[in-house]
Amino acid sequence: LEVQVPEDPVVALVGTDATLCCSFSPEPGFSLAQLNLIWQLTDTKQLVHSFAEGQDQGSAYANRTALFPDLLAQGNASLRLQRVRVADEGSFTCFVSIRDFGSAAVSLQVAAPYSKPSMTLEPNKDLRPGDTVTITCSSYRGYPEAEVFWQDGQGVPLTGNVTTSQMANEQGLFDVHSVLRVVLGANGTYSCLVRNPVLQQDAHGSVTITGQPMTFP
């Protein structure tokens, strides 16, 4: 029995609902009463949802899963996962048994966009050309871990003297803090870009130092 799932991971935003697609071709003589369908976590074999003896056996996964009952008879064995969490990320296997048996695994990639970075400066007053300053770029509650890039006002990448730390909160979302140490020129703009590699989403922050005063666009 050929069971089909998407080759590419299913990307779901934290807090939204995701559909893990799984389908099979209905064969002659097939009826729902003969269908056995099991969704489980691929690695741990933990049961997620099942259908047997013509009945939806329900969710075994925090009551956040559902089948599409009106479509099952047409070969649609997809699973709806509600209110996606970071902890849901991973591989789910769809097992279908009618007269024959087949299975396939689909990957769930969880994502959350990063907030617009906030920029802080230390020291933040009485700055003169030649001073060394620390610019901190902070962006919050994203997933997965971000890629952080710095550049100057001319778009030249700044790679030296950058320290980036990422800490996961209790929901598994990351707060990113990236610190750039730079010697001030006469004036300058310093930009921080926080990129979510899954969503291909960029969040920008910048600070412009013009002697006195400073502006934070």
Epitope: S25, P26, E27, P28, G29, S31, L32, Q34, A73, Q74
Partner: antibody
Framework: EVQLLESGGGLVQPGGSLRLSCAAS????????MNWVRQAPGKGLEWVAG????????YHTDSVKGRFTISRDNSKNTLYLQMNSLRAEDAAVYYC????????????WGQGTTVTVSS | QSVLTQPPSASGTPGQRVTISCSGS????????VNWYQQLPGTAPKLLIY???QRPSGVPDRFSGSKSGTSASLAISGLQSEDEADYYC???????????FGGGTKLTVL
């Protein structure tokens, strides 16, 4: 409303060929297995062939294996039965029938097309 | 010779109850679901009973089906003249990988 319309029947000599078609409307064709069932004059129903929704799996009754081929074109919502090396005993009304996988039964039937095999 | 065995004929008077039997084997009725079809004269067959005992919408509750082991039966109560037709049982046969039909039972309303 789901409708099935067979065509392609007619008079053919023994050893000849015919291709029956069944045009489906009112359904997501690829989601259902389809069958050909025939009925010789004054006789009962005889299942001839069946095909899965994707078309990758086909089944034929022993008496037609090697002579008849069931196929489908899901892009055209059409079921086919290619009949070669026809014999007198193949003469019948040929029905196409859609399976309802909720029930496991053939819930929609066409009106039938008549195949006559005679010299 | 049909894989499923039905009596060739049955009859009854209006208002009577008539039962039609269908006998098979483990590989068909024993392991799979039984369907019944009604064929009125000059028309295509119509699904009458599915999954052993379920009626499609529009089928009167005078028609009922049952299955036990490798046999099934169709019962028609309160027989009416319009019930005069041929009745066929059918099941998927796991050994043959095919649908199998009974030879049909001609019901006559006297």
């Amino acid at each position: 409303e789901v409708q099935l319309l067979e065509s392609g029947g007619g008079l053919v000599q023994p050893g000849g060929s015919l291709r029956l078609s069944c045009a489906a409307s009112g359904l997501t064709f690829s989601s259902y297995a389809m069958n050909w069932v025939r009925q010789a004059p004054g006789k009962g129903l005889e299942w001839v062939a069946g095909i899965g929704g994707s078309g990758s799996s086909t089944y034929h009754t022993d008496s037609v294996k090697g002579r008849f081929t069931i196929s489908r074109d899901n892009s055209k919502n059409t079921l086919y039965l290619q009949m070669n090396s026809l014999r007198a005993e193949d003469a019948a009304v040929y029905y196409c029938a859609k399976e309802d996988h909720w029930s496991g039964g053939m819930d929609v039937w066409g009106q039938g097309t008549t195949v006559t095999v005679s010299s | 010779q049909s894989v499923l065995t039905q009596p060739p004929s049955a009859s009854g008077t209006p208002g009577q109850r008539v039962t039609i039997s269908c006998s098979g084997s483990t590989s068909n009725i024993g392991y799979n679901l039984v369907n019944w079809y009604q064929q009125l004269p000059g028309t295509a067959p119509k699904l009458l009973i599915y999954t052993n005992a379920q009626r499609p919408s529009g089928v009167p509750d005078r028609f009922s089906g049952s299955k036990s082991g490798t046999s099934a039966s169709l019962a028609i109560s309160g027989l009416q003249s319009e019930d005069e037709a041929d009745y066929y049982c059918a099941a998927w046969d796991g050994n043959l990988n095919s649908w199998v039909f009974g030879g049909g039972t001609k019901l006559t309303v006297l």
